[in-house]
Every structure is written in C-alpha cells, then in structure tokens.
C-alpha cells in the first residue's frame, strides 16, 4: 500500500518534471519556429502572407492637405512686409490604392522590382470644402523662373512675359489647380515647346514612382524589403557624399524582429532623401503591440548641430552659412525649381527661417512623423507622414513683380498627413495569425512550466513528507 | 519656314536719317523681340539694339543711345531701326536677328548702310 | 559690359585637322555662350548655345565646352566648308557681347 503511495507520488514527480522540461524546451523551441515561420512569412515572393500586403496594402491611406492661403499679398509685393497666413484643411485624398506593377522576380541576386502607381480620389465627407476652394498662393512660375533662369538678359525677356499675361507674385488657384496643375498664362507665352503646366504634384495621377528593387528576403531575411536600387541607380545624384545613399526600406515594411535600439532607416521619394526614424514609445495599436518610430529633431539639424547633415547644405547663402535649419533644399531634384521642404508649420527649424511668416504654430503632437511598427514581423501597421512644400521665393531686379522685395522668403505653400492604419479586419487577423498565436504559445509554455514545476515540487514534497512519516 | 529680310540700307550723309525695316515670316515678331546687330566692313559683329516681346522694353548699345530707336509693328510682322545722326562709324551691314533666350537662331541677310559725304 | 576675348584671331589648318578655339569672358557667364559660324558676305549661322548645347542642323564634329569664364569651341575634323571666321557671343547680360572673331584659314 505505502509502496503503490510513494510510487504513485514519484510519478506525479516525474511527470511534472516532464511537463516543466517540455515546457522550457518549447521556449526555445517555439521561438525557433516562430522565427522560422515569420522568416518564411515575410519573404516578398509569391503566397506569402507579406507579398500579398505589399503587392496592394490593405491599409486605406488618406492624404490631407492645409493650404496656407495668403492674407496680405499687395503688402508684400509692394513692401516686403511679413507674409500672413492662414491654414485652410484638412482637404482629403484616397491614395495608395493602386497595386504595385510590373513586379518582376530576379532569382539570382534575391530581388524584386516594381513601380507604385500614382493615384489621388478627392474625399469630399472628410474635406472641409471642395476642390472648386481658391486659395491666395505664391505664384509657382514667378517665383521659379528668376531662380532658374539667374541670367539677367533672360530676366528681362521674363518680364516682359509675366506683365504681359498680368502675372504677379501672388495668384488665386483653386485646391485641384494647385495640387494637380493649372496651365499658366506667363509660361504659356514662352515661344518655345515647354511646359506650361504647373501644379505642387503636377505631374501626379497616370504616373508612377520607381523602378524599386528591393531585396526579397528569401537568402538573407535581415536584408527584406531594403532597396537594391532605386530608378536603375544605387544613389540618388541629388546630394553630394553619402547624403546620397539609398538607404533602408520604403518604410512600409522593415526586416523583422525590431529592437529598440534600432535606428529604421528608410527612403522617400517625396523629400528626394533616405531618412531615419528612432524607437519613441511602446504602444497598443487595436490590440497589437507596436514600436513607435519617430523622426527626430536631429535629422532636420543644421551641420552645426549635426555634422552628419553637412551634405544636406548645399547652398550657403539662404541657409546662413548652413546655419539655419528645418528645410531641406530638394531644387536639384526638381528639375532646378526653387522647392524646399520641411515639416509642418516650420516645425525643428531654426527661427530665422519662420520668421517671415505670420500665422504658424508648430506643434510637435500634430506635425511630426511617426512609424509603428510591429516589431516580430517588421510590419508599419500605422504611420503618419507629415511634410511641408515650400517655395523660394527671391528679389529680382528684372522681374517687376518681385523688384520690391528686400529679402527671400521660403514661402509655405501647403503642408500634408498622409496617414494609414491597420483595418480593425486586417487586425483582428493579424492578431490571430501572429501575436495571437505566439502569446498562445508563451501561454502554453507558461502553463507548462509552472503546472510541471508545482506538479514536481508538490509531488516530491509529498514524497518526502510521507517517506519521513512511514521512517517514524 | 522663318524668315527675316532686311531692307532701306543705303547710302546716307552724315548727320543725315535712315530707317531699317525687318520683315519677318514664318514666327511672330512679339513673341520673340528682335535685335538689329551690325558688322563694319572687315570687323566684327556688334550688338546694337533690342526690343523685348510684347512691344516690352527697348534696349541700345551705348554707341547709339539717343540717335537709334527700335520699335515693332506687330500687324504688319515687322521692326524698324530708326537711325538719326549717322556718323561715318555707324557704316556696316546691318543684320535684323530673332532670338528668346539671347542668342540668335535666325539672321537676315544684312542691309549696308554707308555713312559718307 | 562682359568682354569676350578670343583666341587665336586666326589659326591656318587642314582638312581633317581637330581645331580648338577659345573665348573668355571677363566676368562669370555661367554656360550662357553661344558659337557662330559667318562665311564672306553671308550672315552669321548659330552652331552652339549654352556653351555645349549643338543646334539642330549642325553637324556632330562641332561640340562646345566651358563654364563660368573659359569657353571652347572645338573642330574634331576640319571640313572644306568649315573654313570662316567663327564668333563667340555671351548672353548672359545686356548689352550682350562678341568676341573679336577667328578666322579659319587653309594651310
């Protein structure tokens, strides 16, 4: 009888001990195949659960736009007085909604390459307004060509267009003129086959962004998604020295298993620059667990602040000696035209660059730049891209219309959100495909370890209490 | 086809009056400007004069400030030089020529102008 | 006013020689220079502007280069109808400028 107590007793023991070793081997075990899995996940080729997001995201992506309308155009032209704006927004567009083209395979050196179709729908229920809006702006082409054309014989011949089309340094455009194009009547007289079309994202809707190549993961996961190449070329030619780097991903995915310390780099097409995000916050995304990325105040530094944007100066005069900071020059990818950008309402520039202007309140919750990615698969599950389009604006002597100015302005025209969250859907899948299955698995692991490790400890407690009675 | 054919050259006293024509064909005059550039015998070629587009600003050489004038008749497609108190100097081949940007794409074939008593 | 200087005023080639010609500029034109070619009683004929930019129509053995106050105008293999005298022009300001010419003569 004692001796079928005590064996009973040392099976539970050993059955214990069985359940908490099986318990700590499946700990790494798990993590293993969780890994494998993921890795085997988030390789960009065909029937994996990352090529099917990344072909078409399912995220709906919304741009917004506030348009700075000026309120003092005549006193400025004539005085070089202060430019007072006033923000007009959100006006909102569906984008991001076409798949991605052309996607093509190349086995031998584990790429893909692809085109992003342009595309922009107007949302009138999340607008304040239409896209009929007319806004008091900048005038584009004024403003550009004594920039681009700095001879001044041309200047001149300049001139004599903008006054004869009634031109001046400011012009009332509608929203849909302004975003998308508007033929300008001063370009419109240019004797020669130019383009006469102007608008901030002419031309934009019927084209694409790319060629991307990015590698596809499938020989070294570490690598996914970070791009190989970009318009056939490995740098930019934008910016001198490494500034010109393509660097990191698109920022819609990154390889997996981010930590914290990580800095995520990645490229933009839209400020024509490779860029970084630094870990901000752990927060709950619909149940998910996500890293918050932020850009920081640092990647918009002047090279005094910090040397490694010193490429990024590459021109001495508006930018103080490169003092100034919190725009970024992007002229020579834009076909030489005056377009500098920054974040919005001026947000981490240095005072003299705002201090033109009246009527912008920065605020960092608002206009900042955000990524949160879920760190085991790599996946941006949320962002929010804010920039601001801005526009040089120069006296010229030559050009009636800007003769009167005593000093540049960089001219806010409008600044953007694009955002895009993770469809409640799209998340409660994601929940259950991947966080839901490893914390099922940390669960079990949990459960195993500790019911084997009370089982073993009561058991053999019971052992030893009984053995020591049954010796009495 | 542009085309640019000068004429009213001639010879001419000094201190005396000549006015050069430039008929143009093929482009319109104001969308361009015109200038009127001139070549003594075995020198050579100096810029004299300009009229920007759209009947704008109207430009000399200082060697004629005062004495030359340029203008446009944009019905009939054609510029003029008028030239007052020539000077034996101001004897050349003068050349009406289009351009936009600065330099110029098309010539006429000269009209010679000789300033002599 | 920006004075171009030319050289040489005139240099004897021959037919299948490569001919340089420079003009320079006394202050910073940028790439705003263009090239003539002006045969005897003929009007001058644009071959180059921008300083590199071959005007439709010219023949390829022409090109152009410089930027900022130092120009040329190369010849890579002298034609019979190459020889004439060839112009540079700024037209960077007003009052805009020739050089003094180059007269390209038979050897």
């Known amino acids: 009888m004692g001796c079928d107590r005590n064996c009973g007793l040392i099976a539970g023991a050993v059955i214990g001990a069985v359940l908490a070793v099986f318990g700590g081997i499946l700990m790494p075990v798990g993590d293993m195949l969780i890994e494998k899995t993921i890795k085997r996940e988030v390789v960009l080729e065909e029937g994996t659960t990352a090529f099917k997001n990344w072909v078409k995201t399912g995220t709906t992506v919304y741009r917004q736009f506030w348009i700075f309308d000026v309120q003092n155009p005549d006193d400025v032209a004539k005085n070089s007085s202060k430019i007072k704006v006033k923000q007009r927004g959100p006006y909102t567009y569906r984008v991001r909604y076409l798949a991605k083209e052309n996607i093509t395979q190349d086995p031998e050196d584990h790429t893909v390459s692809f085109v992003q179709p342009n595309g922009a729908i107007f949302e009138p229920s999340l607008s304040v307004g239409t896209e009929d809006d007319n806004f008091t702006v900048l005038n584009l082409a004024v403003a550009a060509a004594p920039h681009i054309y700095q001879n001044s014989f041309v200047q001149v011949v300049l001139n004599s267009l903008i006054k004869k089309s009634k031109s001046s340094m400011f012009q009332t455009r509608s929203l849909k003129e302004l975003l998308w194009g508007y033929k300008d009547p001063f370009l419109s007289l240019v004797p020669y086959p130019i383009s006469t079309t102007v608008g901030v994202f002419y031309p934009y809707n019927d084209t694409v962004d790319g060629v991307y190549k990015v590698f596809n993961g499938k020989d070294n996961i570490s690598k996914v998604a970070i791009i190989e190449s970009y318009k056939g070329k490995r740098n930019l030619s934008y910016w001198p020295s490494y500034c010109d780097m393509i660097n990191g991903t698109d920022a819609a995915s990154f390889p997996p298993f981010v930590e914290k310390s990580r800095t995520l780099r990645f490229f933009s097409s839209d400020i024509c620059r490779s860029i970084y995000a630094v870990f901000g916050s752990e927060i709950d995304l619909k149940g998910i667990p996500v890293y918050r990325f932020v850009l920081p105040a640092n990647a918009f530094a002047s090279p005094l602040q910090n040397p490694d944007n010193h490429c990024f100066c590459t021109e001495k005069v508006i930018s103080n000696n490169c003092t100034s900071y919190g725009v970024l020059d992007i002229g020579k990818c834009k076909e030489g035209k005056p377009v500098y950008i920054s974040l919005p309402h001026f947000l981490h520039a240095s005072p003299d660059v705002s201090e033109p202007i009246e009527g912008l309140h920065p605020n960092e919750d608002e206009h900042r730049t955000y990524l949160d990615v879920e760190p085991i698969t790599g996946f941006t599950l949320q962002f929010a891209k804010r920039l601001q389009v801005n526009i040089l604006v120069k006296p010229a002597r030559k050009i009636e219309a800007l003769k009167n100015l005593k000093r540049p302005y960089i001219v806010p025209i409008l600044w953007l959100n694009e955002t895009g969250t993770i469809g409640d859907e799209k998340a409660e899948m994601f929940k259950t495909q991947v966080t839901g299955k490893i914390k099922l698995l940390g669960m079990v692991e949990m459960a195993l370890l500790g019911i084997g490790v009370v089982m073993f400890v009561a058991f053999m407690i019971s052992y030893c209490a009984c053995k020591s009675k049954n010796g009495k | 086809e542009v085309q640019l054919v000068e004429s009213g050259g001639g010879l001419v006293q000094p201190g005396g009056s000549l006015r050069l024509s430039c008929a143009a064909s093929?482009?319109?005059?104001?969308?361009?400007?015109i200038h009127w550039v001139r070549q003594a015998p075995g020198k050579g070629l100096e810029w004299v004069a300009w009229?920007?587009?759209?009947?704008?600003?109207?430009y000399y050489a200082d060697s004629v400030k005062g004495r030359f004038t340029i203008s446009a008749d944009t019905s009939k497609n054609t510029a003029y030089l008028q030239m007052n108190s020539l000077r034996a100097e101001d004897t050349a081949v003068y050349y009406c020529?289009?351009?936009?940007?600065?330099?110029?794409?098309?010539w006429g074939q000269g009209t010679l102008v000789t300033v002599s008593s | 006013d920006i004075q171009m200087t030319q050289s040489p005023s005139s240099l004897s080639a021959s037919v299948g020689d490569r001919v340089t010609i420079t003009c320079r500029a006394s202050?910073?034109?940028?790439?705003?220079v263009a090239w003539y070619q002006q045969k005897p009683g003929k009007a001058p004929k644009l071959l180059i502007s921008?300083?590199?930019s071959l005007y439709s129509g010219v023949p390829s053995r022409f090109s152009g280069s410089g930027s900022g106050t130092d120009f040329t105008l190369t010849i890579s293999s002298l034609q019979p109808e190459d020889f004439a005298t060839y112009y540079c022009?700024?037209?960077?300001?007003?009052?805009?400028?020739f050089g003094q010419g180059t007269k390209v003569e038979i050897k």
């Open positions: 093929g482009f319109t005059i104001s969308s361009f400007g």
């Open positions: 202050q910073d034109v940028s790439n705003w």
């Open positions: 921008y300083a590199t």
């Open positions: 009229i920007a587009p759209y009947g704008g600003d109207t």
């Open positions: 022009q700024q037209h960077s300001n007003a009052p805009l400028t």
């Open positions: 020529a289009r351009s936009f940007f600065g330099y110029f794409d098309y």
